[in-house]
């Protein structure tokens, strides 16, 4: 069937259009193009013979068109007259005729819209103002935006005059927005440029800053306030209902008691004509004085004296407050305030009460700080200790042992050997050691101010024979893949050879193996079932050698997956079932079953007689090791069924 | 239900060897560990040792070892424990008792108890 | 041998006080740690297994906690038939031993 497409069907004024012919017969004599929806030789614009290729104005022609050979016309230049109908009349070979209508529209290209205002400072909980959108155009659409989106919805906002006019009903400052209108229609689209609606307000309540309302004498006083305002408020200030100055800030400097009373702030807005207030209560107080603390015990002995630390100057109706270390009191039996807290009892001081102190008195302002004081405690001496820890010397060397204890103050030492004094240092040298400087060796440490003292004795072997050693461990039960371990072997002795067997072979060459300490330590990394071995450390020096005792290593592992025995899976009806569940682990797992997820006993071996059909489903072998933290399971399907119809096992 | 009966009470002299029974019911026997634990009059518990019936593996207290012995009868679902060499001070109230499961875990059913006294 | 011991010895609380029994190992026995009740001319009974699991039956009033070396029995809310003798007892290999007991009783 002939029909006449339109490209574009809605054209703009000035564009061009092309009426497109589809399904045109075969066999055609000519055509002709009318204006309208039919033919009228007084509205024909062109006609076209195929024959001779010739195209023949008519009536209606306006040189603007062109007619191709495929019947279809080109409108160019178009005007609004040209929008309608236009109708195709073909005449075929055999005459008999065919006609096809097809249409477009002309709209006007639209201008850049504009916006007016009935009101351009409307004043905010009061005025309603009018937008319209300019130019008023026939046949457009009117769209308006707020800060680039689309209208809210609000019962405030009211559209009229064909969306032409949008009303603001009492507006806020939260109108305070950028507005613009669009036009549209169907071949073009404008946006007006932004109107900022200048909405007039306040002034709000004002807020006055800082918020505090105590000060102290001889600080200075600086108020600010705001209050939101368009325009711009006007501040004045009011003390005790006296005019002061019309400035947004207040400062005072060096106030006194005398400066306490009510502060008024006043803000007014010139276009809206309003006023409003707002009262802080200021209140200066006196400086107090500094605190100090005064203490009843100097010189403290530890774990004998109570120091009772006292907070100066008494001050009636005032807190006091503690601190030690920087830190608030911690919650301790041996710390008592009194009930005024202006007194703090240490009871039984230890070295470690030194401190430093500090008290506090409150006021309504602020806390004011003692110097820190700090407590000579006198402690100790404690167990001397003797180095270095060798207890086997070769003979021939020099023997130099240091003695130290915690002490204060710093402790007097004496050297006796055997039981007889050698002398009073805190060191001791023999050169050139014998077999006969072997012997007991003992280090006094004497406190002269709590007048206690402490010994140590310390057993030296001179000998070219060297002791069997043992070995000592960091971790008796590592958990596997987890754990480091280290061996030490014992005694450090001078001059001496460390070596390390496993399972009676030297170590064997392993990134998770590592000597250290001269080889007296041996650390197994990330400790492996595998390393559950006999170790053994054996020391030697030019005259001697010997070896340690064994040591076994004990390491917590699993438990691995467990393995369910039998591995039938298919039984006849009226066997026994005999489930047995196994899985390595160090403590042995706790094991436990599941059949079809409902829990059954804590064993490891299952046992059902005679199942039946009933018995169909899925085992679940449970293992744990609380030891290691780990847990494992496995699950097995039984199928039992009916004597004599499967070739499946019998338990 | 799990049933753990015991013997009655025994009177022996110092010297003289006491041998306990404790017949387990209403569980697969084989299945779970025995142990034995005894209470001295107005004291804790003490643990003895205890038996696997499944293979007759026993463990026993380093304190008790070469003085007792356990031992068990599959047929009877009965399981024994035997003190030797008996003085004042194993007048006790001796206890066997279920094991929840195999390998540690703790005593969920009690026998009743055996009074066991031994005085000359 | 692993030592248990328990703390304290006795108590006496009053009908729905929170009552707490300390048990210590002297060395690590992980989570393998039992309560047991005992009442007067009573066998003991099975409470709580691996610490904390609650043995079927019994009232969700008591419950334990703990791992390593310290463990705790709470009662939530003492009952008049609590009154008995509470033992821990480590299952972490043989030789299992038992704390010596707290006594615990009505005021």
């Known amino acids: 069937k002939l029909t006449i497409e339109s490209t574009p069907f809605n054209v703009a004024e000035g564009k061009e259009v092309l009426l497109l012919v589809h399904n045109l017969p075969q066999h055609l004599f000519g055509y002709s193009w009318y204006k309208g929806e039919r033919v009228d030789g007084n509205r024909q614009i062109i006609g076209y013979v195929i024959g001779t290729q010739q195209a023949t104005p008519g009536p209606a022609y306006s040189g603007r068109e062109i007619i191709y050979p495929n019947a279809s016309l080109l409108i160019q230049n178009i005007i609004q007259n040209d929008t309608g109908f236009y109708t195709l009349h073909v005449i075929k070979s055999d005459l008999v005729n065919e006609e096809a209508t097809g249409q477009f529209r002309v709209y006007p290209e639209l201008p850049k819209p504009s916006i007016s205002s009935n009101n351009s400072k409307p004043v905010e909980d009061k005025d309603a103002v009018a937008f319209t959108c300019e130019p008023e155009t026939q046949d457009a659409t009117y769209l308006w935006w707020v800060n680039n989106q689309s209208l809210p919805v609000s019962p405030r906002l009211q559209l009229s005059n064909g969306n032409r006019t949008l009303t603001l009903f009492n507006v806020t400052r939260n109108d305070t927005a950028s507005y613009k209108c669009e036009t549209q229609n169907p071949v073009s689209a404008r946006r007006s440029d932004s109107v900022i609606l200048n909405v007039l307000y306040g002034p709000d309540a004002p807020t006055i800053s800082p918020l505090n309302t105590s000060y102290r004498s001889g600080e200075n006083l600086n108020l600010s306030c705001h209050a939101a305002s368009n325009p711009p408020a006007q501040y004045s200030w009011f003390v005790n209902g006296t005019f002061q100055q019309s400035t947004q800030e207040l400062f005072i400097p060096n106030i006194t008691v005398n400066n306490s009373g009510s502060y008024t702030c006043q803000a007014h807005n010139s276009d809206t004509g309003l006023n409003r207030t707002t009262v802080t209560t200021i209140t200066v107080y006196a400086e107090p004085p500094k605190p100090f603390i005064t203490s009843n015990n100097s010189n403290p002995v530890e774990d004998e004296d109570a120091v009772a630390l006292t907070c100066e100057p008494e001050i009636q109706n005032t807190t006091y407050l503690w601190w030690v270390n920087n830190q608030s009191l911690p919650v301790s039996p041996r710390l008592q305030l009194s009930n005024d807290n202006r007194t703090l009892t240490l009871l039984s001081v230890t070295r470690n009460d030194v401190g430093p102190y500090e008290c506090g008195i409150q006021n309504e302002l602020s806390v004011d700080h003692s110097d820190p004081v700090i407590l000579n405690v006198l402690y100790g001496p404690d167990d001397p200790t003797i180095s270095p820890s060798y207890t086997y010397y070769r003979p021939g060397v020099n023997l130099s042992l240091s003695c130290h204890a915690a002490s204060n103050p710093p402790a007097q030492y004496s050297w006796l050997i055997d039981g007889n004094i050698q002398q009073h240092t805190q060191e001791l040298f023999i050169s050139n050691i014998t077999e006969k400087n072997s012997g007991l060796y003992t280090c006094q440490a004497n406190n002269s101010a709590s007048g206690h003292s402490r010994t140590t004795v310390k057993t030296i072997t001179v000998s070219a024979e060297l002791p069997k050693p043992s070995i000592s461990s960091n971790n008796s039960k590592p958990v596997e893949d987890k754990d480091a371990v280290a061996f030490t072997c014992e005694p450090e002795a001078q001059n001496t050879t460390y070596l390390w067997w496993v399972n009676g072979q030297s170590l064997p060459v392993s990134p998770r193996l590592q000597l250290s300490n001269g080889n007296r330590t041996l650390t197994l990394f990330n400790v492996t079932r595998n390393d559950a071995r006999a170790y053994v450390c054996g020391i030697q020096n030019s005259v001697s050698a010997n070896r340690s005792d064994p040591v076994t290593l004990d390491v917590l592992y699993g438990p691995d997956t467990p393995i369910i025995s039998p591995p039938d899976s298919s039984y006849l009806s009226g066997a026994n079932l005999n489930l047995s569940c196994h899985s390595a682990s160090n403590p042995s797992p706790q094991y436990s079953w599941r059949i079809n997820g409902i829990p059954q006993q804590h064993t490891q071996v299952l046992f059902i007689a005679k199942i039946t059909p009933n018995n169909n489903g899925t085992y679940a072998c449970f293992v744990s090791n609380l030891a290691t933290g780990r847990n494992n399971s496995i699950v097995k399907s039984i199928t039992v069924s009916a004597s004599g119809t499967s070739p499946g096992l019998s338990a | 239900q799990v049933q753990l009966v015991q013997s009655g009470a025994e009177v022996k002299k110092p010297g003289a060897s006491v041998k306990v029974s404790c017949k387990a019911s209403?569980?697969?026997?084989?299945?779970?560990?025995l142990h034995w634990v005894r209470q001295a009059p107005g004291q804790g518990l003490e643990w003895i040792g205890y038996?696997?019936?499944?293979?007759?593996?026993?463990n026993y207290s380093q304190k008790f070892q070469g003085r007792v012995t356990m031992t068990r009868d599959t047929s009877t679902s009965t399981v024994y424990m035997e003190l030797s060499s008996l003085r004042s001070e194993d007048t006790a109230v001796y206890y066997c008792?279920?094991?929840?499961?195999?390998?540690?875990?703790?005593?969920?059913?009690w026998g009743q108890g055996t009074l066991v006294t031994v005085s000359s | 041998d692993i030592q248990m011991t328990q703390s304290p010895s006795s108590l006496s609380a009053s009908v729905g006080d929170r009552v707490t029994i300390t048990c210590r190992a002297s060395?690590?026995?992980?989570?393998?740690l039992a309560w047991y009740q005992q009442k007067p001319g009573k066998v003991p009974k099975l409470l709580i297994y691996?610490?904390?699991n609650l043995v079927e039956g019994v009232p969700s009033r008591f419950s334990g906690s703990g791992s390593g070396t310290d463990f705790t029995l709470t009662i939530s809310s003492l009952q008049p038939e609590d009154v008995a003798t509470y033992y821990c007892?480590?299952?972490?290999?043989?030789?299992?031993?038992f704390g010596q007991g707290t006594k615990v009783e009505i005021k």
């Open positions: 008792a279920r094991e929840y499961g195999n390998y540690n875990y703790p005593l969920d059913y």
């Open positions: 209403g569980y697969i026997f084989t299945s779970y560990w």
């Open positions: 038996i696997t019936p499944n293979t007759g593996y026993t």
């Open positions: 060395e690590n026995i992980y989570g393998y």
């Open positions: 691996n610490a904390k």
């Open positions: 007892q480590h299952h972490y290999g043989t030789p299992y031993t």
